[in-house]
Amino acid sequence: KFSKQSWGLENEALIVRCPRQGKPSYTVDWYYSQTNKSIPTQERNRVFASGQLLKFLPAAVADSGIYTCIVRSPTFNRTGYANVTIYKKQSDCNVPDYLMYSTVSGSEKNSKIYCPTIDLYNWTAPLEWFKNCQALQGSRYRAHKSFLVIDNVMTEDAGDYTCKFIHNENGANYSVTATRSFTVKDEQGFSLFPVIGAPAQNEIKEVEIGKNANLTCSACFGKGTQFLAAVLWQLNGTKITDFGEPRIQQEEGQNQSFSNGLACLDMVLRIADVKEEDLLLQYDCLALNLHGLRRHTVRLSRKNPIDHHS
């Protein structure tokens, strides 16, 4: 519960925070758990404790292990654990999963990528940023304070972003790199006045008496998740449920999201055992959302059965 995972690369600076919090005046003692050996506070040591922080300047693979911090408060001691792993530098460009910080998402309107853990270090701007190991260049990329801003984000901007900065401790400089994935969310959805794709306005649908018939009402309402959108059928201006004809039922079709991102709905009207009187009814396909209502009317006409006799 009171443990936190930290990782870094050999020959880089790594600063780790004690998972237990307290007041600035509380004493914090650090120990290497495996040996129970106290971590020195003198800054001349490569690994030293500085209050809530444990500093590896620079880190070595052999530093890996569990470190115990004890925050000494007036009434009780709060113990926390920092699980530290130092990895060898990869010769290739690929950043393994175990070196990745949490993934962040961006969209056209918000494309900030924060440099992970940077608040622990004494650094000065500017940050250097890399995507898939390539230095980022061009006016679309702006390093601002501790984050990267990407203008006009596109899906191709998804990938692994590495920030690189210099930590300064008593005049000595140490390099730090941190990598996280960036994913691009679809742009914010929008809502339009309903557009009915089928049936066409005043369409005549041919049906065979005695057979079953299906009519599909299909409409699109905009892009992305829609707050309120519905498609339905009416018979002579009356809801299907109120019309009282058990042979005629409506059934929700597939919610569709086309490749162009449009959010569309289908409603299928099923007429069992078509009768003559069904030809006299007016069938209305209704599509409605917050913008309003659109109606397309269909009528049925008799289709003569194909004569198979010679």
Partner: antibody
Framework: QVQLVQSGAEVKKPGASVKVSCKAS????????MNWVRQAPGQRLEWMGW????????TYGDNFKGRVTITRDTSASTAYMELSSLRSEDTAVYYC?????????WGQGTLVTVSS | DIQMTQSPSSLSASVGDRVTITCKSS????????????LAWYQQKPGKVPKLLIY???TRESGVPSRFSGSGSGTDFTLTISSLQPEDLATYYC?????????FGGGTKVEIK
């Protein structure tokens, strides 16, 4: 500069729950714990609990145990206090206050009124 | 729980007066580990948010006028306003900043004569 901005006033019925948010800015959120303090009209300040914002571990005052839940969202630099089974005596101004030597930084307060 | 008892509960004084508010805790607020007294003083003006004046029993928060001072150790503490000003009209609270649950005194309401 350090700022703590709380959510707006709430009116609740007895038995309901209320959730108050506290958005921090101007400092690194996970470096400091966050306390919640309330003040009923004309009464003294009353500490409700605090949360370790780094690991999400809350500590509650005995008077509120079982009714209060303090959480945080580090990505939004926001702490939350939820109080359930509200009664009329929970009518108060609720404050978030950053941990430190004393509470140097406070939210503006959120008035919660419990009335049938 | 540590009980915090403030006195007086209210007082009225003239501009320029020296004002003293006392606070007693039911247990010592001195931490032997660093010799700090974990006691804080706050000022709360009507309808406003509490403002930290003093922490560690005697350390003035930055920006707080020098007329405010804190003293005491263990269980007995004092807040002194050396020369009362009209803007000091407020309720003053002491707080146990030593152990959970953090507790506050009942407050001292300071009025200007």
């Amino acid at each position: 500069q350090v700022q703590l901005v709380q959510s707006g006033a709430e009116v609740k019925k007895p038995g309901a729950s209320v959730k108050v948010s506290c958005k921090a800015s101007g400092y690194t959120f996970i470096n400091y714990g966050m306390n919640w303090v309330r003040q009923a009209p004309g009464q003294r300040l009353e500490w409700m609990g605090w949360i370790n914002t780094y690991i999400g571990e809350p500590t509650y005052g005995d008077n509120f145990k079982g009714r209060v839940t303090i959480t945080r969202d580090t990505s939004a630099s926001t702490a939350y206090m939820e109080l359930s089974s509200l009664r009329s005596e929970d009518t108060a101004v609720y404050y978030c206050a950053r941990e430190g030597e004393g509470f140097a930084y406070w939210g503006q307060g959120t008035l919660v009124t419990v009335s049938s | 729980d540590i009980q915090m008892t403030q006195s007086p509960s209210s007082l009225s004084a003239s501009v320029g007066d020296r004002v003293t508010i006392t606070c007693k805790s039911s247990q010592s607020l001195l931490y032997s580990g660093n010799q700090n007294n974990y006691l804080a003083w706050y000022q709360q003006k009507p309808g406003k948010v509490p403002k930290l004046l003093i922490y560690g029993a005697s350390t003035r928060e930055s920006g707080v006028p020098s007329r405010f001072s804190g003293s005491g150790s263990g269980t007995d503490f004092t807040l002194t306003i050396s020369s009362l000003q009209p803007e000091d009209l407020a309720t003053y609270y002491c707080q146990n900043d030593h152990s959970y649950p953090y507790t506050f005194g009942g407050g001292t309401k300071v009025e200007i004569k």
